[in-house]
Amino acid sequence: LIIGFGISGRHSITVTTVASAGNIGEDGILSCTFEPDIKLSDIVIQWLKEGVIGLVHEFKEGKDELSEQDEMFRGRTAVFADQVIVGNASLRLKNVQLTDAGTYKCYIITSKGKGNANLEYKTGAFSMPEVNVDYNASSETLRCEAPRWFPQPTVVWASQVDQGANFSEVSNTSFELNSENVTMKVVSVLYNVTINNTYSCMIENDIAKATGDIKVTESEIKRRSHLQLLNSKAS
């Protein structure tokens, strides 16, 4: 969490941002809140990006003002216009690109004063893994697949029964480049599994950590998946 304060002159106002991550090819949100003002027409929101000459987005007098917007953000940004009055300056970002990563500044002017806060935005690809029993294999085998990751993640297998066991010798992981030549499909196979056990396939890079669990018994198979973004720090 980053909390910024205003500059001298007028009074300063508190602006708060949260570091976040965007999934490339999907839509993202850059979070920013501020001390609200009672009059929408008095609120100016500017989003800036380090190293970019034009603005990322500007909202003033109750509407978007995009004449100074940088070309790389054209048609891709919006604030939640109906929530600005309650202090939400968060930015929607369409079709997140790798090049959108960097340091952003959320700069606010209201009748109470000015304030800003920086936000670190990471970009990559992350997706939920699915673990299945591979019935085509010669021995009891599990197959963990996740369609989109970038940068290349690590894959670690774990089991509830054999806690602390190292499965690297009995697993094989491959990474297949997807058609857009950036993200990769992750496939990891675990051999010699035993029934009445819960296995976890954990995929992690510097942006996200995802886990796919499978419990195999003689009567049923239960699955569960979980994905968690890393380094969400508020400022």
Partner: antibody, heavy 119, light 107 residues
Framework: QVQLQESGPGLVKPSETLSLTCTVS????????WSWIRQPPGKGLEWIGY???????NNNPSLKSRVTISVDTSKNQFSLKLISVTAADTAVYYC?????????????WGQGTLVTVSS | EIVMTQSPATLSVSPGERATLSCRAS??????LAWYQQKPGQAPRLLIY???TRATGIPARFSGSGSGTEFTLTIRSLQSEDFAVYYC?????????FGGGTKLEIK
């Protein structure tokens, strides 16, 4: 109520330049993006390009560099120029307003003007 | 560019029935999709944006759903004025592209 009206010649000779103007009434041309879209007879829709009141533009690469879109805020108008036309450019040409900067649907349209390319 | 494919090309449905129109994108467009209705001799009319949000003045019988690559426009209890051509359009990436259209005709 915002209204858009296309104007320009209905017949253009091959290799010449197609020129159309869209006049916006009932609202300011400022604060919105504006687009040209065309529809060959009996076929589907093709986006040509957009302009913002500040003059920033983007065109469909399929039309290569044949397209120029310009704006005149004092007249509340924007214009399309398409050079080196061929019969394949025969279409109904629409001007339209982009709903907002994020949701690029087109919420207001002109009635369309048929431009025929023929000698 | 992102290719939008609509199916079926023609759909025959009786008035009062439900119509389901499909649109598929060649790659994910998230929820950045619009639907239009076009009647002969008229300009298209925006029905849906953001894949599921009805535009101003559009009756509740029109609904949109889907995200990623698969989208559906559903018209329940078809009225006589609903028979027209319907187009989907993606605005996830440049250039903006439209589907080839589905003609909804009276059965």
């Amino acid at each position: 109520q915002v209204q858009l009206q296309e104007s320009g010649p209905g017949l253009v000779k091959p290799s010449e330049t197609l020129s159309l103007t869209c006049t916006v009434s009932g609202g300011s041309i400022s604060s919105y993006y504006w687009s040209w879209i065309r529809q060959p007879p009996g076929k589907g829709l093709e986006w040509i390009g957009y302009i913002y009141y500040s003059g920033s533009t983007n065109n469909n690469p399929s039309l290569k560099s044949r397209v120029t879109i310009s704006v005149d805020t004092s007249k509340n108008q924007f214009s399309l120029k398409l050079i080196s036309v061929t019969a394949a450019d025969t279409a109904v040409y629409y001007c339209a307003r982009v709903y907002n900067n994020y949701d690029w649907g087109f919420d207001y349209w002109g009635q369309g003007t048929l431009v025929t390319v023929s000698s | 560019e992102i290719v939008m494919t609509q199916s079926p090309a023609t759909l025959s449905v009786s008035p009062g029935e439900r119509a389901t129109l499909s649109c598929r994108a060649s790659q994910s467009v998230s929820s950045n999709l619009a639907w239009y209705q076009q009647k002969p001799g008229q300009a298209p009319r925006l029905l849906i944006y953001g894949a599921s949000t009805r535009a101003t003045g559009i009756p509740a019988r029109f609904s949109g759903s889907g995200s990623g690559t698969e989208f559906t426009l559903t018209i329940r209890s078809l009225q006589s004025e609903d028979f027209a051509v319907y187009y989907c359009q993606q605005y996830h990436n440049w250039p903006l592209t439209f589907g080839g259209g589905t003609k909804l005709e009276i059965k």
